[in-house]
Interface confidence: medium
């Protein structure tokens, strides 16, 4: 017999998504236009290019790197499309609800989509490490809390610490790592007896991941660089960015092999230790003088990365049931850090090269502001779990974890799982 | 020698959109280190910054005028444009635009980018009645 | 939005004083602070950048100092030409560069 949806969700998914779907057509609808003013063509090409990269970075990149377990590569690739196309949705609404609103409409522009393209990254990012352990149906409600804690959140920031939008989205690295593993800390843990091989990878998802990790990487110097306004300030971004993940690279194959008793190089440090570089570097990635700075940066980041792998995996998997093959939560949470505590010694440099007495309020403020992340991070986290965790969704058998068969058809599989 | 001359409607009925447009000579409007803002001075009243647009086309605006202002650029004709909608006799002011380079200083550990106006346009005045 | 306030609102010299207006930011804004003066009927005209800088063609009497919150403006001996007013300008903050409300430079 094949395998199949239990009925109960078969009728409440494409219910609940289509219902959602029809109900953003018509905020859509009643609340948004675009941009009528006259751009300049040139400008228009340039600016959505970067769009495109941040896309092909979300769709292919995120997509194939979450795809390396044995048995869950498609649900990956087609989940993080579909979490992707609906978080974009909701992210331009959003956007324009919180810093729009009071003119009645919803203005989108190409800056605005960029911005909804990256919100929904931070989804892509959480993900990680829950996919294969939820439905879509849980997923969509993953997307819409998430979007929702990040937009206030980068509002709050806004306002509060008055940050422009590179900084309080470079905050993503944070929120998306702890949003994360806070949601799989709520979910069912132990694997049972006999399913273990499911969140093992395989060589050809292997290959896969590695060419969204290949996608990522050349794209990183765009993510890091896309919400800066100054030209000069985004060639900055794009060339510190540059130098940090190809020096990240370098770190990431040696220090894997270094790691290994007999010298072999691991796919699983390799994917996730090569953008490495990128996520330490993306709150500063402007500010940096030289490249030397932004190379020791991505070789320290690729060090912890390699690190990370090889120690942390035991301890997420025993607390918080996450496979050893997902580690861009705990990656990320740790590169992340390390990014705004680089942010923060830069502020101090800066205050004490100029001579200027408010050092300890600056600091105060960037510890805040990463302070908050966090927190709302873990806050609206636990929430998202909770509420998966309710027994509405029909949530995978723990038996049925990694398994694409339960959510795809296989023509050519006599028998189901 | 570099000028900026605006030029628009002097008078404008409430409700109604205001499009000013700034003409600039004496550098390129592609040049990654220039932008350009616009800038208002009510009779009698303190300088305010309303929006500001870089080579690349990206965009800045004042957080209280948002909603009301657009700005973009035609670079073939080394214009400027800004538009305010929904137009009230309280936006009665003197409108500048000036040149507005970007200055990278290296600092010991990190970089500076400083922006000023630098060149002034004379400004054109913009009386809102009925 | 980080506010700049000038003090004094306005102040009454002599040809040949020295001259100081104060400019203090609502937060730390670094050394991104200018200076520009204004006379009556005119643009203004950019004096000084980056708390410090002197704009090219700006007479040498005119200085800025400060970093952080304060910021000064000093005029080291007063000029007939130099009766107008004068803004400080944050550009640490984007999207809204603030502007001072402006002192005012009379003759005595």
């Known amino acids: 017999m094949s395998s199949k949806y239990p009925r109960s969700v078969r009728r409440c998914l494409p219910l609940w998504a289509l219902t959602l779907e029809a109900a953003l057509i018509l905020l859509f609808y009643f609340f948004t236009h675009y941009d009528a003013s006259l751009e300049d063509q040139k400008g228009l090409v340039a600016s959505y290019q970067v769009g495109q990269d941040l896309t092909v970075m979300a769709a292919i990149g995120l997509g194939f790197l979450t795809s390396s377990f044995r048995r869950h590569s498609w649900s990956s690739v087609a989940f993080n499309l579909f979490m992707l196309a609906l978080g974009v949705q909701w992210a331009i609404l959003l956007d324009g609800f919180l810093s729009q609103f009071p003119s009645g409409k919803v203005v989108i522009t190409l800056f605005s989509i960029r911005l909804a393209t990256m919100s929904a990254l931070s989804v892509l990012i959480s993900v990680d490490a829950v996919l294969g352990k939820v439905n879509l149906a849980q997923l969509v409600v993953m997307v819409l809390v998430e979007v929702t804690a990040l937009g206030n959140l980068r509002m709050v920031i806004s306002n509060i610490f008055n940050t422009d939008y590179h900084m309080n989205m470079m905050h993503i690295y944070v929120f998306a790592a702890y949003f994360g593993l806070s949601v799989a800390w709520c979910l069912p843990k132990p694997l049972p007896e006999g399913t273990e091989d499911k969140d093992q990878t395989a060589t050809i998802p292997s290959l896969s991941a590695m060419l969204g990790a290949l996608f990522l990487w050349m794209f990183w110097p765009s993510f890091n660089s896309a919400l800066l306004r100054s030209p000069i300030e985004r060639k900055n971004a794009v060339f510190n960015t540059y130098y940090a993940v190809a020096v990240s690279v370098v770190t990431a194959i040696s220090g894997s092999s270094l790691a290994h008793p007999q010298g072999k190089i691991s796919k699983t440090y390799v994917h996730s230790a090569v953008l490495a570089g990128g996520v330490a570097v993306g709150t500063s990635c402007h500010l940096i003088p030289s490249p030397w700075l932004a190379m020791v940066l991505g070789l320290v980041a690729g060090l912890i990365s390699v690190g990370g792998a090889k120690y942390l995996p035991g301890c997420c998997n025993r607390v918080l049931g996450i496979p050893h093959s997902s580690i861009m939560g705990y990656n990320f949470s740790l590169l992340g850090l390390l990014g705004e505590i680089i942010y923060i010694v830069l502020l101090v440099l800066d205050t004490v090269g100029a001579g200027n007495g408010m050092i300890g309020f600056q600091v105060l403020l960037s510890i805040g502001e990463l302070s908050l992340a966090i927190v709302i991070a873990l806050m609206s986290g636990l929430l998202t779990g909770l509420l998966l965790n309710l027994k509405i969704w029909k949530a995978p058998h723990e038996a049925k974890y990694f398994d694409d068969q339960v959510f795809w058809k296989f023509p050519h599989l006599a028998v189901g799982f | 020698q570099v000028t900026l001359k605006e030029s628009g409607p002097v008078l404008v009925k409430p409700t109604e959109t205001l499009t000013l447009t700034c003409t600039v000579s004496g550098f390129s409007l592609n040049n990654a280190r220039m932008g350009v803002s616009w800038i208002r001075q009510p009779p009698g009243k303190a300088l305010e910054w309303l929006a500001h647009i870089f080579s690349n086309d990206e965009k800045s605006y004042s957080t209280s005028l948002k909603s009301r202002l657009t700005i973009s650029k035609d670079t073939s004709k080394s214009q400027v444009f800004l538009t305010m909608t929904n137009m009230d006799p309280v936006d009665t002011a003197t409108y500048y635009c000036a040149r507005t380079p970007i200055t990278m200083v290296r600092g010991a550990i990190r970089l500076y980018y400083y922006y000023y106006m630098d060149v002034w346009g004379k400004g054109t005045t913009v009386t809102v009645s009925s | 939005d980080i506010q700049v306030t000038q003090s004094p609102s306005s102040l009454s010299a002599s040809v040949g004083d020295r001259v100081t207006i104060n400019c203090r930011a609502s937060q730390s804004i670094g050394t991104y602070l200018n200076w520009y003066q204004q006379k009556p009927g005119k643009a203004p005209n950019l004096l000084i950048y980056?708390?410090?800088s002197l704009q090219s063609g700006v007479p040498s009497r005119f200085s800025g100092s400060g970093s952080g919150t304060d910021f000064t403006l000093t005029i080291s001996s007063l000029q007939p030409e130099d009766f107008a007013t004068y803004y400080c300008q944050q550009t640490y903050s984007t999207p809204t560069w603030t502007f001072g409300r402006g002192t005012k430079v009379e003759i005595k």
């Open positions: 980056a708390a410090s």
